[in-house]
């Protein structure tokens, strides 16, 4: 039961995380105009990965896409790539994890196959989360660097007569959405990996037992040639869980609202 819950929760957390990564990637507010130096601006600028926007005094917002590919900073391209890789891996991970869910039966799929799929999706979620966190962090670092550079430019070489207020950008909402979403995907992936350990059918660890047959003094160890390893073959059709061996019927779970997507 604990394994099913862990797997199910990992799936749901990852699903929320990936939805967040997609949302963050699409959001326009990766960087927003810093209002510290100009709190009374009637024209508010903010930028995303795909376009930059200006909200004017009338309340109208005009957004313009970055229609050039070669003219964009390499860092922005890298962030785009990281976020897209994160989304793709996450989406594949979600697809794999749906089939790996213990509460969903697909034909006569072996538990070992489900365990492998759970592990695969877990690893995909972890990498997806890391990609998102990395992408957002690279962008944040870029913002911090530019912020201090523009601050330095603001107060130098103008002889105290600063007429043009240079627009500085600070962290936008998308960065926080991305960090949280990446973290959730990462946690979901870890949970899937933990669930995988519980799903994997292990061999039962039997202690060597001495059988005293009449007229002979020979010690037999069950498991044939495996006797030397101390593991016997698990001949009964049971799954080995962290909490002990249980039959499949004992861990029957009822479908929850998260089981079918």
């Amino acid at each position: 039961m604990a394994v099913t819950a862990c797997q199910g929760l990992g799936f749901v957390v990852s699903l929320i995380g990936i939805a967040g990564i997609i949302a963050a990637t699409c959001m326009d507010q990766w960087s927003t105009q810093d209002l510290y130096n100009n709190p009374v601006t009637a024209v508010f600028n903010y930028q995303g990965l795909w376009r930059s926007c200006v909200r004017e005094s009338s309340g109208f917002t005009e957004c313009r896409g970055y229609f050039t590919l070669l003219g964009l900073p390499a860092m922005l391209q890298a962030v785009r790539a990281l976020m897209i890789v994160g989304i793709v891996l996450g989406a594949i991970g979600l697809l794999v994890s749906i089939f790996a869910l213990k509460c969903i039966r697909i034909g006569s799929m072996e538990d070992s196959a489900k365990a492998n799929m759970t592990l695969t999706s877990g690893i995909m979620f972890i990498v997806s989360g890391l990609c998102a966190i990395a992408g957002v962090s690279v962008f944040a670092n870029m913002l911090v660097t530019n912020f201090w550079m523009s601050t330095a430019n603001m107060y130098t070489g103008m002889g105290g007569m600063v007429q043009t207020v240079q627009t500085r950008y600070t962290f936008g909402a998308a960065l926080f959405v991305g960090w949280v979403a990446g973290g959730l995907t990462l946690i979901g992936g870890v949970m899937m990996c933990i669930a995988c350990r519980g799903l994997a059918p292990e061999e039962t660890n039997y202690k060597a037992v001495s059988y005293h047959a009449s007229g002979h003094s020979v010690a037999y160890k069950p498991g044939g040639f495996k006797a030397s390893t101390g593991f016997g073959s698990n001949t009964k059709n049971k799954k080995i869980y962290d909490g002990g061996a249980r039959t499949e019927d004992e861990v029957q779970s009822y479908p929850s609202k998260h089981d079918y997507v």
Partner: antibody, heavy 115, light 113 residues
Framework: QVQLVQSGAEVKKPGASVKVSCKAS????????VHWVRQAPGQGLEWMGY????????KYNEKFKGRVTMTRDTSTSTVYMELSSLRSEDTAVYYC????????WGQGTLVTVSS | DIVMTQSPDSLAVSLGERATISCKSS????????????LTWYQQKPGQAPKLLIY???TRESGVPDRFSGSGSGTDFTLTISSVQAEDVAVYFC?????????FGGGTKVEIK
């Protein structure tokens, strides 16, 4: 077509309050801020503030803070501007304006403050 | 607050002549986000509400005759009427649309000689 129709002229005594209405039509009311500007007789234009009909957010000119209140009624697409503690120098034509670059203005409401 | 200074206060020109109105702002109105100057020009005829002529310092509003043109960037702007017509008699205002409080120039009255 886009229209901003304002309420009629008002005559008020000093110390009183006036509430001017501005009914918008011909566009999505919540998409654009509604600003208020006044013009004293023979004088220039003075910005008073705005209201965002979408979320009721307001921003006022410091000069009028504490005296001006802007409200809206989305059901009738109407914005109200109330100016309190009226003085003789508040005698002016009050305009509401909206849309991009303030392409549309109301016809103006003359508020006369006299004892 | 950004101070908008218009000159001259009044201008008398003959029909068909060129009229030039200057507007200076105490701070730059150039928005680095889209490289646009947030300066607007309005025309106000006697007894009427102001009418939008030019936005972004140089973009003519639709329906405005092409004899009206705007130029300038940063802090110095100009409105030009290339060939003044009788219907152009009005007061012209420039407006800072970049920073609150939004501020207007004192106005320039254009008359026919």
């Amino acid at each position: 077509q886009v229209q901003l129709v304002q309420s009629g002229a008002e005559v008020k005594k000093p110390g009183a309050s006036v509430k001017v209405s501005c009914k918008a039509s011909g566009y999505t009311f919540t998409n654009y801020f509604v600003h208020w500007v006044r013009q004293a007789p023979g004088q220039g234009l003075e910005w008073m503030g705005y209201i965002n009909p979408y979320n009721d957010d307001t921003k006022y000119n410091e000069k009028f803070k504490g005296r001006v209140t802007m409200t809206r009624d989305t059901s009738t697409s109407t914005v109200y501007m109330e100016l309190s503690s009226l003085r003789s120098e508040d005698t002016a034509v009050y305009y509401c304006l909206s849309l991009r670059f303030f392409a549309y203005w109301g016809q103006g409401t003359l508020v006369t403050v006299s004892s | 607050d950004i101070v908008m200074t218009q000159s001259p206060d009044s201008l008398a020109v003959s029909l068909g002549e060129r009229a030039t109105i200057s507007c200076k702002s105490s701070q730059s109105l150039l928005n680095s986000g889209n490289q646009k100057n947030y300066l607007t020009w309005y025309q106000q005829k006697p007894g009427q509400a102001p009418k939008l002529l030019i936005y972004w310092a140089s973009t003519r509003e639709s329906g405005v005759p092409d004899r009206f043109s705007g130029s300038g960037s940063g802090t110095d702007f100009t409105l030009t009427i290339s060939s003044v017509q009788a219907e152009d008699v009005a007061v012209y205002f420039c407006q800072n649309d970049y920073s609150y409080p939004l501020t207007f120039g004192g106005g320039t009255k254009v008359e026919i000689k």
